[in-house]
């Protein structure tokens, strides 16, 4: 039993670290392997993670961890029964993969714009809450060549989009992902897409009905 690609781990820096590795042959990860992890700190408990298969020889382990701090270092040991296959350390703050932004919605806004909004995946007290910047991908559902990428480097999880920059009458999808520059993180996974129809002439006809009541 041999490890082909040694474990690579990422932390969401709040509750979970995920390690992935590849064995040199197809392996029933949950039956044959265990990943033990222990905070490198006096009196810390040793924990065991039961890996799952992703592919026939790729194993993934999700480890619940406490709210991370920069000094945290975990000792990792990969076991096949009594045989130690690999040993290494993991510092969550150096391998951050942010959580996926949530609840992406699109709303008609004043001045012929669409307002895209989503939620920051971290509570305000977490280090990453104020560190995230975002990438928004907007694509035409029927034209793969028609797509735009927006970098949202300001704090608020919103993006204003001029309807005139998109084709009228076309269906568009948007998705968003996050990055923590200070931590030199990897990108988060993309959020689920949200889809809308882009009409901008005449704009008023395409506002949600409850907006019209304000004019009476």
């Amino acid at each position: 039993v041999k490890v082909l690609h040694e474990p690579s781990c990422f932390s969401d820096y709040i509750s979970t670290s995920v390690c992935q590795w590849k064995m040199d042959h197809p392996t029933n990860c949950s039956a044959e392997l265990r990943l033990s992890y222990q905070l490198d700190f006096m009196g810390s408990e040793n924990h065991t993670c039961v890996p799952e298969n992703r592919e026939d020889s790729v194993c993934v382990c999700s480890m619940p961890i406490d709210d991370a701090v920069e000094a945290d270092v975990y000792q990792l040991d990969l076991w096949a029964g009594q045989q130690l296959l690999w040993s290494g350390s993991f510092q969550p703050s150096k391998h951050v993969k942010p959580r996926t932004p949530g609840n992406l919605t699109v709303h008609p806004n004043i001045s012929h714009t669409w307002l895209l909004m989503w939620t920051n995946p971290y509570p305000t007290e977490n280090h990453l809450h104020s560190e995230l910047t975002y990438m928004v991908n907007v694509s035409n559902d029927n034209d793969p060549e028609d797509f735009k990428v927006y970098n949202v480097t300001y704090m608020g999880p919103t993006l204003r989009l001029a309807a005139s920059t998109l084709k009228s009458g076309a269906s568009y999808s948007a998705r968003v992902r996050a990055w923590a520059q200070t931590y030199n993180s990897t990108w988060s996974d993309w959020s689920p897409s949200t889809t809308w129809l882009n009409y901008y002439e005449p704009w008023e006809q395409h506002l949600p009905h409850h907006h019209h009541h304000h004019h009476h």
């Epitope: 690609h5 992935q20 197809p26 592919e55 026939d56 020889s57 990897t186």
Partner: antibody
Framework: QVQLQQSGPELVKPGASVKLSCKAS????????IHWVKQRPGQGLEWIGW????????TYNEKFKAKATLTVDTSSTTAYMELHSLTSEDSAVYFC????????WGQGTTLTVSS | DIQMTQSSSYLSVSLGGRVTITCKAS??????LAWYQQKPGNAPRLLIS???SLETGVPSRFSGSGSGKDYTLSITSLQTEDAATYHC?????????FGGGTKVEIK
Amino acid sequence: QVQLQQSGPELVKPGASVKLSCKASGYTFTTYDIHWVKQRPGQGLEWIGWIYPRDGRTTYNEKFKAKATLTVDTSSTTAYMELHSLTSEDSAVYFCARSSPFGYWGQGTTLTVSS
Amino acid sequence: DIQMTQSSSYLSVSLGGRVTITCKASDHINNWLAWYQQKPGNAPRLLISGATSLETGVPSRFSGSGSGKDYTLSITSLQTEDAATYHCHQYWSIPYTFGGGTKVEIK
């Protein structure tokens, strides 16, 4: 020796469906994933998804979720990919391959979508 | 999705020369990178996996290097049979993705 033998070329009309096959031999079929890859003329490679023959579990590239359905028949050690609602964009060579990274490939099936 | 960018789509190199093909990932792929050689009408052939490990039967003039987001395939003392298209492939993150390919021609 490990072999992946794919079905022959297909010419189909827009809107139709087609089922491509990949017959595996020379190893225990249920042990390894089978992946499918698309290559349009003069273009790069696109990963469609994989199926794990032991339990039929699939993972798709989001882009192909509505386009492709992967299945296997363990009794004949054959993997299948059905492509739906075909358009000219689906005209390509489709390869099956065993387990990432892809050390074993089928010879490819050429699909032409034309009226 | 992780984008894989091969900076050159075409390279013309002298027989016996050296060629270097680069591949840049849009995010970390932790060395889960493979290189393939493909000749017209054929399926790709795996040359290198894990960024640096040469597959059995692949000549030693091929080598792979890199880490993080940046990877390189090198071919020294180029032979006529090395004329082909070379693809990089990340298999770290789903969906797996490929570079656009680099066609190597022998002068």
